[in-house]
Structures are given as C-alpha cells and as structure tokens.
Interface confidence: low
C-alpha cells in the first residue's frame, strides 16, 4: 500500500531533491494540528498566530479578542486559562521544566472586566499546579507541597494540607513515579462538576529509596539531584485520597476516602479519579500485583460529611491471562444516570471492547465486539457514544472515530471518518464540546495531517481548522520514500511491518536494512501516521530500506499478543523482530550483509538484546538510553509485566533477562550505546552497567554519554545524537559521506 | 487437575500441639488465597484461618476468633504445601480440618477441598 | 460479624420436585455469597459463587439468586444425587468468613 502521492513527470523528478539530516533537524516538515480550547457547546479559544487569545462562536460565526499578545507579552506569558464565568485569565510565565508532564510556573491573574492585573494577595512562586474550579472562579493550587484554595482570585488563600515537604509528602501533585507510570499527569487534584468539593492526592514517600545523579552544570562541585524512586520490588509510595469541601473548607477539613477492603489488605495503588456528581466520586485502585483493580463508587453523607463506599458499589476488573488493562486500567464514562457507566476491558474473547455496567461487571453489557479493538470513549451524550477503534478494513494501525446511537433500540453504529478523506486520513483523534453540540477531527496522516471542524448531530464538515497547506508546498520538490503498511503471518503470530523504502526503490537491487524497535509492553509502532524524520532521511538520502515490526507484546491486536510476554519481557519481543528480518531477507531486495537496528528506552533493551542474540543477523545496532536489567527500572511499570524480583516470584527471569548476562554475544556486532547522563526515567546505571559488563568482557563497542541531558536528550543533544548515529550506520553500511 | 491432601491428623490430648499439612498441585499455588475450615462431627461447616499474599511478597493471615493467638497458618510456595500450627488444643477443636482454595485471586470462596484428615482431642 | 441464618433445617422433597433454599444475612453480603453440597462422608463441593455464577461443571438445574441480605438456590427438578446437606457462606464482610447451619435435603 503505498501511503505517498506517487510522482509521476520525469521532468518533475530532475527538480526534485532528497531530504537532507538538516531538514530533519530544523523541523523544516514538521505538521500543526488544531485543538479547539471548548468553553461551551458552541465556543472555543485558540491562540492565533500573532499570540492573540480569540473566542470562536461556531453559531453566529463571529469571534473577538478576549486577550490581546500585549497583555500576554507584558507578563512573557507562554500558556493561559480562562476561568469558567469568563471574568478572569490566568498568565503563565516562567516555565520550568521538572518531569514528563511536571512543571512550574509563575502565574499572574488577569481581571477581564477591567483591563487589569489583579493585585493584592498574589500568588506564590513558582507554582507548582494550577487550576480554576469547573464553575465561578475559585482557584486550586499547589506551591511547596501542599493545596491553597481562594474563592476569589483576589481573596487571601485558605490553606488546605500543611504537612507537604518536598521529596517526602506530596498533595495535590503525583511523586516521580506515579506522574511517569501511573496518573500520567502533573495534577493530582480534581474539582467536582460544580466545584463543591476538591479531591487530592497525598503521596507518602518517606520510606521510598532514592536515586541520585551528578547533575555537572557550571559550578566548581556537581550538584546531586535526588529523586524517590521506586525500582522494582522496592518499597511504594504510600497514597491517601482526601476530599474537602471549598464552600466551608474550615468546617470538616478533608475528609479521607476508604480503600476498598480487598485492595488496602496488601500494598495497592490509587489509579485515577472520575467525578460522576457533586456528591458522587469514582475512584480506581489497583493491588501492587496489577491483575486485580477494583473500581469503587463513593457518596457523600451529609449527616456525617464523610465519603461512604458501599461494598455493593464496588466492581472488580480482574486478569487471568496477564495484567489489569492495557497500558493502564481503562477509565469509566458514566452515563446520565450517574451510576452506570461505559468502559473498556477484554471480553472472553479476549479483545478489548466497550461494556455498559449496570450493576455488575459480571452482568455487563457488551457494547462493541469483533477481532479488533475499540480504544478509546471520546463523549457519551443521551443519545450517543462516540469512540474510536482500529476495526476498519483490519488494519490494527489506523484509528476511526465511530458513533453508537444508544438513545434508539437496537443501537445502531456508524463511522463517521471511514470515508472522509480515505487516502489521505486513516488515523483520527477528536476533540468534543458541550454535549458534543461540535467536535474537531484531528486526522494525523498518513497523508498530510489536516483538522476540521463538525456538526455532533449530523456529523457535517463545518471548516477546515488547519490543512497544513505551506507543508505541502515545501514537499513537492522533496523525494519522500514509499511506505508500506503490511502483515507477516508466522506461526500463528501475524506480524504487522511498516516499511520505508527509499524513492526509487527496486525490487531487483539489493538495499542496507535498518529496524526501528520500540516493542515495549502495550506499545504501537506501525501506525497509519504521517511522518518527516530520521529514518524518511535516511530512506530517501541513504537508500536505506527501514522497517519497524510489531510483534508479541504490542497492542490493539488482543490479549494473545499483548500479554504474550507476560512475566517474560525480553524473550518474545526479540524473537518476533529476529523472525521479521528473516522474512524480510526471503523478499529478495535486502543486502543480508548490511543489516542493523536501533531502539530508544525499551528500544534500546530490545535492540541491545537483538544484537545480543547470536543469531549472526545484525552487523551494527544502537541502543539509546537502553533498560537494561529490569531491576533498575521504575516498580510500577516493571511489576506489571513482570512480578516482584523474589525468589518466590520471578526473581530467576528478572536475572535472565539482563543485557549485562549476554555481554559475550557482543563480540562479533558492532554496538553504540548512548545515554544521557541526568535520566531521571531509564537512569544512567543501566548503560554504566552494559558497559562494565562489555568492559569485564573484554568486548570493544562505541559510546556516547550526554552530560547532563535526560531521557529524551532534547536541545542540542537531538542534533548532536542523530549526526553521531548517522554517521555510525553509513560507516557500518559502507555509505560514503 | 487440581489436587488438595490434608495430612497431620490425630488423636491428641488438651493442651498438646498438632501440625497439619496440605500439599497442593495443578494451580499457581501463591497466586491463590489458601484456607482452613473444619467440621466438628454432625456439625457445619466452620472457618478457622485464611492465608493469601500481598502485593509486596508478604503474607497476611486471618483466624477466626475461636482459634486466635493458638493456631498459625503457614505456606511454603517452593514446595506448594499449606500448613496448620495447632496449639494449646481444646477438646471443642474436634473436627474434620479442610484446606480449601480461593476461587480467585481475592475472593474466599472455595472451588476445591481436601478431602480433610480428623484432629481428636480427649483426654 | 454478618450471621446466615438458613431455612428449612431439613426439606422433605420427592425426586423431580423443585427445592428452593433460602439464606438470610444479618447484614449486607452484597453480591458475595456462595452455596456448597455435602454428601455424607465427603468433602464440600462448591455449587454457585457470587449469588448466581455456576460453578464449572455444575448442572443448570442449579441456580442462584438475591443480593443483599437475602438469598435463595434453587433446584428446579431433584435428581436422586441432590439429597445432600446445602451450605451458604458469605465472603463480603470477613474477617470472619461465616457459613450457614445447613439445610438438609432429603428424600421424601
């Protein structure tokens, strides 16, 4: 399937040039999408080009500007937010990095209905988290550790938690471990729909071990940056949910939500939190061994102001065949009546699929079901479901969004973005307003990306949002490389494969192959999807064939393939990426001589392992910020694929799994190995450790270590990696320079 | 298939001390929550103690209050075998002891049984 | 400690007829309750979990149903291997785990 507009005029083709490494590195391709910023049914804001905050009214067409770029200027504000009764704006400034989603900031609040700053008891800085309530304008925030609350932007803060220390008591916001594995979020407090009550998080991690890194900066001594982690089979935060009522926060104080009683018997985790009323809160928990979640539906009790959670409103999602969920366990969408409500988990068949839960999870309807799988529920309305699923013409790797009428009988289903744009758009995501009165699709390729603007009743394309027009000028001098998205069936396992071949690929030559494996647990890498990166570079400038293979252990294919490597990561990820280029090298167009892989984070464990496989297939290989024993990795994430590293667990396979035990294997490869050295996620001990064991192996192998960089090595580092990386394969694959 | 044999049985007098067995095959033994419940004769059934583990590689135990502070439950995963500390035994402790399995991870309901050995204590 | 409370002591039944078995709770057991058959001389064998989920390998003749604080098993038409000792225990509220009295199922 060739997923490229062909170019067809020979005159055309003498004009045309291939991509560059420059290209890639100054995002010279690079796609915008339009996310609308909803505020009702029928408005949204988004900030213009020239940086200024317009209010978009879908119905009468008009739109204005709520905040000019000289307001946001005067404060150097990157971001903003409207508060819900539209009488304030808060400016953020001074952003500061902290992990994957965690941040502070400065804010500054904007009074809208008199052109001014509101001054007089200011907030802190800097901010760690921020938020308006969902109605009026109060504000939650997080500085030091610990919640404030004002009922006015202008009001003193009333202070919620004071027992916040930092790397010891966290409220409000998650620890390391949870904002990387489990909440994926920065926040870890929620308004409830009409902003009575907030719900928190305190995470507990004095008992935690902590890692710590030399961060070298400039000083004459490193600093020492130490963060609680987690690794697996080590001590957990500990985590209490808390509710407070912001109408008399004074009155009761917070309140503690109970643990269900089969999850707070062992250790457990909280995983995440979904308001369903004013005075009705779902939470999600989830036992240390993640087969075992319980979803627990909690009501206020006015007489005592308490949280009451009745056993008979508790439901169980348990696993018999691998962990809860897919990456995470799935959230519910409740429905009007406020306590049934919609999720996604395996039906018997082992495919995960949208259920209705009335009552029971064993009496739970089954909604959408089929050998494909539905992914995520965007909007349940009175009258429809919206979601997306991978069902479409079989293709694991594209995305559809689908409505359910559930207001008629017998529900009937619809795609609504199968056949818009069917070449160009095979990959969807949405964005939904108000009552889902409109909704953006977000289409991400595989042709150019393009967002447009919908009728949600009669699913009407109303505008086009952003088509990415001067992308697709820039391309059509460029040779892009054919791609294509296609099956390998191999013992009972269908292997899906995407691969990139260079533009005036022929099947009679022979070309270097590079993979690209990222493999991990629950992941996906071959995806209808548009793209302009390295490895387009490397197809098109190169003549480099590069193909990324989904095997045993990735998603949206069934519970077969996803918890295949249940307790055993390591094993069958590697063998399905060994067994593609097998079939790969029968096609006939594969120089067998000049064949290498590359992976980043789990990438970098699986390519290391690959290389490691004494299979004599790969010549070179590279592994970027590498796992490599799953003992140095975070508990969370570890334990869910793979136990505890006990004797009485798994300990045995944890051991065997290590890139450090097949050091020998390394001899007759050539290896670069990379890492930066201020990783607070994948940290710089796993690669300290491959290379001892190389060292202790007498074993030669290349690398590159980036001071002070973490795991996604940005800023510089990304020029500085892909040219090294470049130029290590061309040298492998005897490509001159 | 799933296997449960009590041994350990006998007849003891008050006060003296007995260790039950329970060797268990056909199932992750430590993934399931293990159970003993005895039958005094002409009687019903009734619980005396639960074993299951946690998430962080212990173990929690429950007793029913009629043995508490006498009986210890016990499990030795390596060798898939159940076992019942018995001490300072009274002549009300006459029964039928079965080992039981969880039908899940969590819930203490009992899918398989032993088929139970007899603990007598008289003087 | 949530007490079962079962009814009849003994039932007196001919084959083919319907047995209906009653369980009652002192408090709550929601959906956690299950039945077990005792024959003389033999081990317990579980019948029903959760209040109406047969368990593997158990005749459709069997059912469950209630929540709460009341139960019932059902046997729509004895066959001479049902005449046994039927127990209800409750796994919602534990410890302690509690079984009921039993009801005797006899042939008539």
């Known amino acids: 399937i060739v997923l490229r507009p062909s170019r067809v005029h020979n005159s055309e083709e003498n004009t045309m040039r291939a991509l560059t490494l420059k290209d890639i590195l100054n995002g010279t391709f690079s796609y915008k999408t339009f996310f609308p910023n909803w505020i009702s049914g029928q408005e949204y804001l988004h900030q213009s080009a020239d940086n200024n905050i317009v209010l978009y009214n879908i119905e009468t067409g008009q739109s204005y500007t709520i905040l000019s770029n000289r307001t946001m200027k005067s404060v150097n504000a990157s971001n903003y937010g409207l508060s819900p009764d539209r009488q304030f704006v808060y400016l953020e400034s001074d952003y500061s990095k902290l992990w994957r989603y965690s941040y502070t900031a400065t804010y500054y609040i904007y009074d809208l209905s008199n052109g001014e700053f509101v001054r007089g008891n200011e907030l802190p800085r800097p901010i760690q988290y921020l938020c308006w309530s969902p109605v009026g304008s109060k504000l939650a925030y997080v500085y030091q550790n610990n919640i404030y609350l004002k009922q006015r932007p202008g009001d003193p803060p009333f202070q919620i938690t004071f027992n916040g220390r930092e790397n010891k008591i966290f409220n409000g916001i998650p620890d390391w471990v949870y904002e990387e594995e489990m909440l994926a979020t920065k926040y870890a407090l929620w308004w409830s729909p009409n902003g009575k009550f907030l719900a928190y998080a305190e995470f507990n991690d004095t008992d935690i071990p902590v890692i710590a890194y030399s961060y070298y900066g400039d000083e004459q001594y490193p600093r020492t940056i130490n963060i609680p982690y987690p690794k697996a089979g080590a001590k957990n935060p500990v985590v209490r949910i808390f509710i407070i009522d912001t109408t008399y926060p004074a009155y009761v104080g917070p309140q503690e939500v109970p643990v269900p009683a089969m999850i707070a018997s062992s250790d457990y985790y909280f995983s995440w939190l979904t308001w369903v009323t004013d005075e009705r809160v779902c939470l999600q928990w989830l036992k240390r061994v993640q087969n075992v979640s319980v979803l627990s539906i909690c009501d206020f009790r006015e007489d005592w102001q308490t949280w009451d959670c009745p056993k008979t409103q508790e439901h169980i999602e348990e696993s018999r065949t691998g962990w809860a969920g897919g990456f995470f366990v799935s959230t519910p969408v409740f429905s009007y009546d406020a306590i049934s409500y919609y999720k996604i988990f395996s039906d018997k068949d082992g495919y995960k699929h949208i259920h209705y839960i009335k009552d029971t999870v064993e009496n739970a309807i089954q909604i959408t079901s089929g050998k494909w799988e539905a992914i995520n529920i965007f909007r349940v309305t009175q009258d429809s479901l919206f979601y997306s699923s991978n069902e479409f013409e079989e293709y694991p790797g594209r995305r559809n969004i689908y409505r359910i009428s559930i207001g008629s009988y017998p529900p009937s289903k619809k795609c609504v973005t199968c056949h818009l744009r069917k070449e160009r758009c095979q990959y969807y995501t949405a964005s939904f307003s108000d009552y889902a009165k409109y909704y953006a699709l977000v289409c991400y390729g595989p042709g150019i990306p393009i967002s447009t603007l919908h009728d949600g009743r009669t699913d009407q394309e109303i505008k086009i949002l952003e088509e990415n027009k001067e992308l697709e000028n820039a391309l059509k001098n460029i040779q892009l490389p054919k791609e294509e998205i296609k099956k390998l069936e191999v013992d009972e396992i269908t292997l899906w494969y995407k691969m990139i071949l260079p533009p005036q690929f022929d099947r009679s030559k022979k070309y270097p192959l590079l993979i690209q494996v990222y493999g991990g647990p629950c992941s996906q890498s071959v995806r209808s999807v548009f793209a302009v990166n390295w490895i387009s570079y490397l197809a098109s400038k190169e003549g480099m064939v590069i193909a990324l293979v989904d095997g045993r252990g990735t998603a949206f294919q069934g519970d077969k393939l996803l918890y295949a490597v249940y307790r055993k990561l390591g094993v069958y990820e590697v063998e399905d990426q060994i067994t593609a280029v097998r079939k790969f090298i029968e096609m006939g167009f594969i120089d067998e001589k000049r064949i290498a892989i590359w992976g980043w984070s789990y990438g970098g464990y699986v390519s290391s392992l690959a290389l490691a496989s004494g299979t004599g297939l790969f010549k070179c290989g590279i592994a970027v910020a590498p796992v490599s024993s799953w003992e140095y990795y975070a508990s969370v994430y570890t334990e869910r694929f793979m136990g505890l590293p006990t004797k009485d667990d798994n300990l045995e396979h944890y051991k065997n799994s290590t890139v450090m035990a097949r050091a020998e294997y390394f001899r007759n490869v050539d290896y670069l190995l990379i890492h930066g050295t201020a990783d607070d996620n994948v940290h710089f001990q796993n690669s300290a450790q491959i290379a001892k064991a190389l060292v202790n192996a007498q074993v030669d192998f290349q690398a590159m270590w980036y001071s002070d960089q973490n795991h996604g090595l940005s800023g510089l580092s990304t020029n500085h990696l892909y040219t090294h990386m470049t130029h290590f394969l061309k040298q492998c694959f005897s490509l001159s320079d | 298939d799933v296997q449960l044999v009590e041994s350990g049985g006998g007849v003891v007098r008050p006060g003296e001390s007995l260790r039950l067995s329970c060797a268990a095959s056909g199932f992750i033994f430590r993934n399931y929550a293990m159970t003993w419940v005895r039958q005094a004769p002409g009687e019903g059934l009734e619980w005396v103690s639960t074993i299951r583990s946690s998430g962080s590689g212990r173990t929690d135990t429950y007793y029913a209050d009629s043995v508490k502070g006498r009986f210890t439950i016990s499990r030795d995963s390596s060798n898939n075998t159940l076992y019942l500390q018995m001490n300072s035994l009274r002549a009300e402790d006459t029964a039928v002891y079965y080992c039981?399995?969880?039908?899940?991870?969590?819930?203490?309901?009992?899918?398989?049984w032993g088929l139970g050995t007899l603990v007598t204590v008289s003087s | 400690e949530i007490v079962l409370t079962q009814n009849p002591g003994t039932l007196n039944l001919s084959p083919g007829e319907r047995a209906t078995l009653t369980c009652r709770a002192s408090?709550?057991?929601?959906?956690?309750l299950a039945w077990y058959q005792q024959k003389p001389g033999q081990t317990p064998r579980l019948l029903i979990y959760?209040?109406?989920t047969r368990a593997t390998g158990i005749p459709d003749r069997f059912s469950g149903s209630g929540s709460g604080t009341e139960f019932n098993l059902t046997i729509s038409s004895l066959q001479n291997e049902d005449f046994a000792v039927y127990y209800c225990?409750?796994?919602?509220?534990?410890?302690?785990?509690?079984f009921g009295g039993g009801t005797k199922v006899e042939i008539k």
């Open positions: 959760d209040v109406n």
């Open positions: 408090q709550s057991a929601g959906r956690n």
């Open positions: 039981a399995k969880s039908g899940t991870f969590w819930d203490t309901f009992f899918d398989y």
């Open positions: 225990q409750q796994y919602n509220n534990w410890p302690p785990l509690t």
